[in-house]
């Protein structure tokens, strides 16, 4: 199963950690996809390492663990984020996070 904070908030110009936790006694994680709506943010592959989409490469840092640190947030970053865990032999598991970027006080 995937466990995640469903709703998170952060300040404009700040950073936030996007984190999904996968728990299984038998399945091994082989790949994790991170998307902002339908746009690819980053992919982690156990065989290749991290690939960060070029459009986000200056603002997205892999980690901690299989999560992402999203930096220099703008109001336009408000929205849904999805993690997709590819596991063997367990199949595919998805998680959803809603990020609200608030104006800095």
């Amino acid at each position: 199963t995937i466990d995640t904070k469903r709703n998170i908030s952060a300040e404009e110009g700040g950073s936030v950690i996007l984190q999904c936790h996968f728990s299984s006694d038998t399945a091994e994680v082989t790949q994790v996809d991170w998307k902002q709506q339908d746009q690819l943010l980053a992919i982690y592959s156990v065989d290749l390492g991290w690939h960060v989409a070029s459009v986000f490469s200056d603002r997205v840092v892999p980690g901690p663990s299989l999560g992402l640190t999203f930096q220099s947030l703008t109001m336009n970053d408000t929205g849904e984020y999805f993690c997709t865990y590819h596991t063997y032999p367990g199949g595919i598991y998805k998680g959803r996070i809603f990020l609200k970027v608030q104006e800095s006080s």
């Epitope: 592959s45 156990v46 065989d47 290749l48 390492g49 991290w50 690939h51 960060v52 892999p62």
Partner: antibody
Amino acid sequence: QVQLVESGGGVVQPGRSLRLSCAASGFTFSSSYMHWVRQAPGKGLEWVAVIGADGSNKYYADSVEGRFTISRDNSKNTLYLQMNSLRAEDTALYYCAKPVPRRRGLDVWGQGTMVTVSS
Amino acid sequence: DIQLTQSPSSVSASVGDRVTITCRASQGISSWLAWYQQKPGKAPKLLIYGASSLQSGVPSRFSGSGSGTDFTLTISSLQPEDFATYYCQQAFYLPWTFGGGTKVEIK
């Protein structure tokens, strides 16, 4: 024994195309990611591209993105590198290589095939 | 992309010497670093993966250490067959990248 044999290199003019092949044997090719790495004469190693076991998950070095295409035919145990719009700086010895699963090191290499881009 | 800087670019040593080669990454790469040996006219040979794990069949005089940004390859007692060029390679981020190489020459 595990073996990789590259072919298809040669002399080609700038702007032209070439397709490299890599014949694999001695291991379960269809279960392995495969990489291309190149080495310009007298220079160091440069990673070029990788392809997933099933032909998905293709990634490229910035220097070849949009010009080179990596592909594979698992029924023939063969890896390919289609090189278009070749430039003088693509002149190199091209190696195919197999990684250690999950370890991200390249443990089996071919002998290489030389590509020379010159007018 | 991650830049890997190897030092020194060349080293002269004698049989029996202890040789140390360093590799510094422009960003943290955890322990995802491999080391290769290449002899003239030959393909590279994997020595170390995961910064410190010895590849099967590689002599125990080769060892690797480090994590984050700073890594070391050590040859404890240089043998005649060890004169070659050594490369580090990171595999934390795509694209994978190699260091510029260190040539180990006979003094």
